[in-house]
Interface confidence: low
Amino acid sequence: DITPSVPPASYHPKPWLGAQPATVVTPGVNVTLRCRAPQPAWRFGLFKPGEIAPLLFRDVSSELAEFFLEEVTPAQGGSYRCCYRRPDWGPGVWSQPSDVLELLVTEELPRPSLVALPGPVVGPGANVSLRCAGRLRNMSFVLYREGVAAPLQYRHSAQPWADFTLLGARAPGTYSCYYHTPSAPYVLSQRSEVLVISWEDSGSSDYTRGNLVRLGLAGLVLISLGALVTFDWRSQNRAPAGIRP
């Protein structure tokens, strides 16, 4: 049997494989996989790992072929590659395969984690960074604060995480985050677990602050008493000297 033989990388350079509307979609969406060759091709093949023959093929006299996956199901998710060829390359010879495209078909994305960097306890003057980490790249991340309806911050990230910076003075509070695909049809993740950000040593700070007030008041009382004692003492010394019989 003739099986695909892959030539050296420089010989037939790899094509590019992309997905429309996205690589992450909900079930039932129509997905188009686009394979673009660096030169005019004749046949394009869409491959899944371990398959000898193409899953789908398209014959086009150009650099671009489109593979239509109608009303996708979770089972159609997974790794895809595409190759291109021309008949004069000989039996079974394809180009180098494209980079893997991971297609994810799901109702909901996995829950992200939310952590504080360097930690969830902040000093009055220090900033804190919150990292919302999912499992997928090129997602949009949203940070929420408890008690505030609108998103606090919004980030698009090429990495599978996004960092949100909070100013120290405003940092304390309860936070959560989620992420979603950057364009329609949107696929959302579950909300993260909540994260509580608090003041550094907030209990002893309150105690000290109270004590300072008390010490201040005590100081004022002492100063007042001292003033009165001094006033009284000076009054007594003057009278005898000043009174004549």
């Epitope: 049997d1 003739i2 099986t3 695909p4 005019p40 004749w42 046949r43 093949g45 398959e51 000898i52 023959a53 193409p54 899953l55 789908l56 093929f57 014959d59 086009v60 006299s61 060829r85 021309r86 008949p87 004069d88 000989g90 039996p91 079974g92 394809w94």
Partner: antibody, heavy 120, light 107 residues
Framework: QVQLQQSGAELVRPGTSVKVSCKAS????????IEWVKKRPGQGLEWIGV????????NYNEKFENKATLTADKSSSTAYMQLSSLTSDDSAVYFC?????????????WGQGTLVTVSA | DIQMTQSPASLSVSVGETVTITCRAS??????LAWYQQKQGKSPQLLVY???NLADGVPSRFSGSGSGTQFSLKINSLQPEDFGSYYC?????????FGGGTKLEIK
């Protein structure tokens, strides 16, 4: 050796349908495309379409898109072409062919042909 | 669709002669062309693929040439078994159309 054995001649009524079979042997059926070609008396060859027996994927000549339906049964290594709503224009010899290489090009192996005659 | 124009439509020649059949594509098809021979009541047989490559078992008196839009099939020293019809076919974008054919007859 590679062989494609087609079903026998068919005499059918206009408006009906017919299913032509093409049994493959001598190679891994799912690794090569099966093509279908029409030859009318005194006329040239016309390419109808191709099926990937492994995935069931098909490509049709637009002219035959509403006329021919290509299928394949992996268990019996047989490819089928169903022709529907037959008219006298469908009277022809129909050939199945296997590509030279696994992904489909150059019709290297041919069946013996199936004569379909549409007549009232 | 790409149109394949084959000429001549028919040719009457004697055994031992050399003939050339041409095929013109309506647009550039690079080297994506095949030649077939078909005898009366028989299946077509692949002669040449990728414009110039001789298929297995095909005698060396057959040769294919050309690329782009102009192609030709040359048969040197015609033998009695070479008479029949010849077709070109492109493989550059579906549908894969055939030329109208050239009928080669004995003079």
């Amino acid at each position: 050796q590679v062989q494609l054995q087609q079903s026998g001649a068919e005499l059918v009524r206009p408006g009906t349908s017919v299913k032509v079979s093409c049994k493959a042997s001598g190679y891994a059926f799912t690794n090569y495309m099966i093509e279908w070609v029409k030859k009318r008396p005194g006329q040239g060859l016309e390419w109808i379409g191709v099926i990937n027996p492994g995935s069931g994927g098909t490509n049709y000549n637009e002219k035959f898109e509403n006329k021919a339906t290509l299928t394949a049964d992996k268990s019996s290594s047989t490819a089928y072409m169903q022709l529907s709503s037959l008219t006298s224009d469908d009277s022809a010899v129909y050939f199945c062919a296997r590509s030279l290489d696994f992904d489909g090009a150059w019709f290297a192996y041919w069946g013996q042909g199936t004569l379909v005659t549409v007549s009232a | 669709d790409i149109q394949m124009t084959q000429s001549p439509a028919s040719l009457s020649v004697s055994v031992g002669e050399t003939v050339t059949i041409t095929c013109r594509a309506s647009e550039k098809i690079y080297s994506n062309l095949a030649w077939y021979q078909q005898k009366q009541g028989k299946s077509p047989q692949l002669l040449v693929y990728a414009a110039t490559n001789l298929a297995d078992g095909v005698p060396s008196r057959f040769s294919g040439s050309g690329s782009g839009t102009q192609f030709s099939l040359k048969i040197n020293s015609l033998q009695p078994e070479d008479f029949g019809s010849y077709y070109c076919q492109h493989f550059w974008g579906i549908p894969w159309t055939f030329g109208g054919g050239t009928k080669l007859e004995i003079k």
